[in-house]
């Protein structure tokens, strides 16, 4: 291809790609008609004056994953058509003032994964058409007022993975078109009232993995278009009553990994579009009535790994669309007979790793579509007659690691389990804990007459006599609600080059990969 440097490959579509450790300077001559240039994985350490002077038609320039630590202010002179510029994954500590001067068409500027220590208002003052600015993965400790004042068309700003300890309430005030703001993985301890007031078109706000302790009551009151709000892994100990009041478009809210002790009624809402609410790994001790009653479209509610010991009978009022409820790894001893009454569409419930000693006979009475129930590792000695009778879709029931009492009263449950073994899975079966002479024996095959020879076994009405079998040959544990496969916590739908590193285990919330989104 005419005019293509030997260390590069050039395509007929005016795309040039130069890669390799042997490259130590911008290759020349570059094709005059190049529209896309990528310089990747080279040993280039600096960009001198005007290395791209003869390729003024360039639209996209990617200089990534190099050793680049120094750029001359005029390096990008004559690139008036450039729309996309990436300097990501280099070793830049300083940006010269005026570096982006003349880049009048620039829409995307990626400066992520460098070592930038500061930015100044003058850096971006010429970039009036910029729509996307990526600054994540640098060493920024402070954003000065005015830094983004000229970027009135900006729709996406990523400041994640820096060292920001505070944010000025004025720094985003002119970004009325911003749709995505990411501030995750910084060291923010609080966010001043008014910080987000100018962001009337904001759709996503990522504040996870900071050290935020308090949220101002009106912090999000101007963000009526917010759809995704990530507040997980902070130090939030309480939520002001009105903090989420003005978020009618919100469909995703993550609050896991905080220090919340209580959820005050009405805190969530009205949020008619919220589909998922992640509250695991907090210190919640009780759930009052109506705490979620504004979340009419909620489908996933994760409350695992808290300290919940009391759930008011009306706690889940309003959750008529809920599909997944995770309550595992809490301190539940009792459940009121009406507590799940409203959950008509519930499919999966995880109650494992609690201290439940008994279940009300009608606990699942209105929850006819249940497909999976996790009850392992509780203090259950028996279950009420007919508790699962109406659950025709139940295909996964985990009952192991409970102290089952194998006396004559266990017979109805034993009979039902015998006829419904496919539901129990093959990993671990429930075993008797008492009497001592049958301890450790499978509850399903135990001879109750042997277990309590001195007790006459009465004719007890059995659990349903018709065995139930799944439609498909097997339900592998990899797709089960109790799967312990390592999976991410809520996917934080990022489409840029960043990936959020998550180490959360699937067992955090006891659900399937498909359910995690």
């Amino acid at each position: 291809y005419h005019g293509c440097p030997s260390e590069c490959t050039c395509s007929r579509a005016s795309q040039v790609e130069c890669t390799g450790a042997r490259i130590v300077a911008v290759p020349t001559p570059l094709p005059w008609n190049a529209m896309s240039l990528q310089i990747l994985n080279t040993h280039i350490t600096e960009l001198n004056e005007s290395p791209f002077l003869n390729i003024s038609a360039l639209i996209a320039l990617r200089i990534e994953k190099n050793e680049l630590s120094r750029i001359t202010p005029g390096a990008f002179r004559n690139l008036g058509s450039l729309r996309y510029l990436s300097l990501a994954n280099n070793k830049l500590q300083v940006l010269p003032i005026g570096l982006f001067q003349g880049l009048d068409s620039l829409e995307s500027l990626l400066l992520s994964s460098n070592q930038l220590l500061q930015i100044q208002p003058a850096h971006f003052s010429q970039c009036s058409n910029l729509k996307e600015l990526q600054l994540h993965g640098n060493h920024l400790e402070y954003i000065p007022d005015g830094a983004f004042d000229h970027l009135v068309g900006l729709t996406k700003l990523n400041l994640g993975k820096n060292s920001l300890t505070h944010i000025s309430p004025r720094v985003f005030q002119h970004l009325g078109n911003l749709q995505v703001l990411r501030l995750y993985e910084n060291r923010l301890t609080d966010i001043p009232m008014g910080t987000f007031d100018g962001l009337v078109n904001l759709q996503e706000l990522a504040l996870q993995q900071n050290q935020i302790g308090l949220l101002s009551p009106g912090l999000f009151h101007n963000n009526h278009n917010l759809q995704r709000l990530y507040l997980s892994n902070n130090h939030i100990s309480q939520l002001p009553p009105s903090v989420f009041m003005q978020l009618p478009q919100l469909n995703r809210l993550t609050l896991f990994g905080n220090s919340l002790k209580e959820l005050s009624p009405g805190i969530f809402g009205p949020m008619p579009n919220l589909r998922e609410l992640w509250l695991y790994d907090n210190h919640i001790s009780s759930l009052p009535d109506n705490v979620f009653s504004n979340l009419r479209q909620l489908q996933v509610l994760i409350l695992s790994r808290n300290q919940i010991s009391f759930i008011s009978p009306g706690a889940f009022n309003g959750l008529t669309e809920l599909r997944e409820l995770s309550l595992h790894t809490n301190a539940l001893q009792d459940l009121d007979g009406n507590v799940f009454r409203m959950l008509a569409n519930l499919q999966n419930i995880s109650l494992q790793n609690n201290r439940l000693r008994q279940l009300p006979g009608n606990i699942f009475a209105n929850v006819n579509g249940l497909m999976a129930i996790q009850l392992q590792n509780n203090q259950l000695e028996n279950l009420p007659l007919g508790i699962f009778d109406h659950l025709g879709k139940l295909c996964e029931l985990r009952l192991y690691d409970n102290p089952w009492r194998c006396d004559s009263d266990i017979l109805p449950l034993r009979n039902w389990l015998l006829l419904n073994q496919p539901r129990l899975g093959t990993d671990t079966v429930p075993v008797c804990f008492s009497p001592a002479n049958v301890r450790g024996q499978s509850l399903i095959i135990i001879n109750v007459n042997v277990a309590v020879p001195s007790v006459h076994v009465p004719e007890v009405p059995s659990y349903p006599e018709t065995p139930w079998y799944p439609d498909t040959p097997s339900y592998p544990d990899t797709t089960s609600v109790s799967s312990t496969t390592e999976l991410t916590s809520p996917v934080e739908d990022y489409t840029d080059l960043t990936t959020i590193q998550v180490t959360d285990d699937r067992s955090v919330w006891g659900m399937t990969q498909a359910q995690s989104g």
Epitope: S264, P265, P288, D289, N290, Q333, G337, N338, R357, P360
Partner: antibody
Framework: QVQLVQSGAEVKKPGASVKVSCKAS????????INWVRQAPGQGLEWMGW????????KYAQKFQGRVTMTRDTSTSTVYMELSSLRSEDTAVYYC???????????WGQGTLVTVSS | DIQMTQSPSSLSASVGDRVTITCKAS??????VAWYQQKPGKAPKLLIY???YRSSGVPSRFSGSGSGTDFTLTISSLQPEDFATYYC?????????FGGGTKVEIK
């Protein structure tokens, strides 16, 4: 239908204890929390605590902690509220009450008058 | 503890009158407020729960409203059997607390 029937009136001396019973019928006794609420003569209502009959777990209002004990007998579907170290200000009608679909009191016993007088 | 301040403590009204009783919580209780009617020598009777939902069998002249800290019970047209004492109760957090009561008397 749900019914809560309480024991009869009691007269006690200061310092004594009283044990009031509440017999439940019309539903599965072990499956629903039962509360105790009292009302001094001419006064308002005061929540004392709850018991979960299935397990015997209790929660008491701080004001009564150490003086009140709530127990149950599942064989007779009866809950008991015992108040010790009685003083004249404990003179009141004591009600047992069951929650409905929320933590409000849908079903009430008829009340038991406890008079503390020397 | 959450205080429930009910007003007025008593009122005189005639049959057919519209009666309004208010209850103010000392902190946010969402919609977790119930209203009860009590007649002398009887146990209280649930009228309204979740601030605005009428209990089964309660006449439509009784209505409730409010959320957060301010709540109202309204009797749209007072009937002879409505002369009684009315209590509000919060069940948002322990200990559950009641208002001091409002006695509705015949004028």
């Amino acid at each position: 239908q749900v019914q809560l029937v309480q024991s009869g009136a009691e007269v006690k001396k200061p310092g004594a204890s009283v044990k009031v019973s509440c017999k439940a019928s019309g539903y599965t006794f072990t499956d629903y929390y039962i509360n105790w609420v009292r009302q001094a003569p001419g006064q308002g209502l005061e929540w004392m605590g709850w018991i979960y009959p299935g397990s015997g777990n209790t929660k008491y209002a701080q004001k009564f902690q150490g003086r009140v004990t709530m127990t149950r007998d599942t064989s007779t579907s009866t809950v008991y509220m015992e108040l010790s170290s009685l003083r004249s200000e404990d003179t009141a009608v004591y009600y047992c009450a069951r929650w409905g679909y929320g933590a409000y009191f849908t079903y009430w016993g008829q009340g038991t008058l406890v008079t503390v007088s020397s | 503890d959450i205080q429930m301040t009910q007003s007025p403590s008593s009122l005189s009204a005639s049959v057919g009158d519209r009666v309004t009783i208010t209850c103010k919580a000392s902190q946010n209780v969402g919609i977790n407020v119930a209203w009860y009617q009590q007649k002398p020598g009887k146990a209280p009777k649930l009228l309204i729960y979740s601030a605005s939902y009428r209990s089964s069998g309660v006449p439509s002249r009784f209505s409730g409203s409010g959320s957060g800290t301010d709540f109202t019970l309204t009797i749209s047209s007072l009937q002879p059997e409505d002369f009684a004492t009315y209590y509000c109760q919060q069940y948002s957090s322990f200990p559950y607390t009641f208002g001091g009561g409002t006695k509705v008397e015949i004028k």
